[in-house]
Amino acid sequence: MMTGTIETTGNISAEKGGSIILQCHLSSTTAQVTQVNWEQQDQLLAICNADLGWHISPSFKDRVAPGPGLGLTLQSLTVNDTGEYFCIYHTYPDGTYTGRIFLEVLESSVAEHGARFQIP
């Protein structure tokens, strides 16, 4: 029986040209994490395997950095990076757990404008 739950950073926004950390955490299970896949809309970004370590897809090598931990750092963000990201935890003996993060990449001026309105 799968008892675990995935906690994620949920919906996040970041500035164009900046970077962001995508983070998921598996809790409430003693299952062993054998691999974590990071995906974006039917594209493989990276894999972290318990035995083999990290594999970053060639097309993302310049903009994706492994970690911290099982998370993923996206760099040099563009508006095209806006969308859904998934962390897929492969565990033994539970099976697969999936977490979802929505990232919105904002134009620099929009991000700054939004920040000014949030500060009294």
Epitope: T34, Q35, E39, D42, Q43, L44, I47, N49, D51, L52, H55, S57, S59, H90, Y92
Partner: antibody, heavy 118, light 107 residues
């Protein structure tokens, strides 16, 4: 250099048994899942069986389930395929393949021919 | 089981030609699609993994694209050593399945 070397193929009668071996070198064998894939003469590729690196969980094609057993000895860096109740349709070249990250087969052995005939 | 349908089953082309091979899955397989090249009497060789990632050491004239159910292998400028049979393979779920193959022959 990664190397996979199959052995154990040969001519066997229908209903007979054979054990194939795949000797691995050049990488940490226990860290990788492994597949057996076969190819009948003049035909395409057919997946046969799969075994995980350390956990040892396995999976089989329906065509061989209950007759073939995949296993591994990580201390010997060797993968095995025990083939029982062999049929004429099992005649093929059998390849072992390494599977990093569970998604693709990046290295293959040269294959060993199994012929089932009376 | 997931069926993989490759087309065409064979094609004739000349050195320098752009060649496109397609592979269709019977259900969505996300990016879990790999391409292999096989020459007579030899083991298959990995060309493209995860739909679009070029395997280390494979010439950049090979490229892969697609996701979901429809995938494409493209050879931008066919070379003499590229005449071979090409297979797609899904690793989304077991049983793993291969396409029927596409034989690329010299025109």
């Amino acid at each position: 250099e990664v190397q996979l070397l199959e052995s154990g193929g040969g001519l066997v009668q229908p209903g007979g048994s054979l054990r194939l071996s795949c000797a691995a070198s050049g990488f940490t064998f226990s860290s990788y899942s492994m597949h057996w894939v076969r190819q009948a003469p003049g035909k395409g590729l057919e997946w046969v069986a799969y075994i995980k690196g350390s956990a040892g969980s396995t999976s089989y094609a329906d065509s061989v389930k209950g007759r073939f057993t995949i296993s591994r000895d990580n201390s010997k860096n060797t993968l095995y395929l025990q083939m029982n109740s062999l049929r004429a349709e099992d005649t093929a070249v059998y390849y072992c393949a390494r599977v990093p990250y569970g998604v693709w087969m990046d290295y293959w052995g040269q294959g060993t021919l199994v012929t089932v005939s009376s | 089981d997931i069926q993989m349908t490759q087309s065409p089953s064979s094609l004739s082309a000349s050195v320098g030609d752009r060649v496109t091979i397609t592979c269709r899955a019977s259900q969505s397989i996300s990016y879990y699609l790999n391409w292999y090249q096989q020459k007579p009497g030899k083991a298959p060789k990995l060309l493209i993994y995860a739909a679009s990632s070029l395997q280390s050491g494979v010439p950049s004239r090979f490229s892969g694209s697609g996701s979901g159910t429809d995938f494409t292998l493209t050879i931008s400028s066919l070379q003499p050593e590229d005449f071979a049979t090409y297979y797609c393979q899904q690793s989304y779920s077991t049983p793993l399945t291969f396409g029927g193959g596409t034989k690329v022959e010299i025109k």
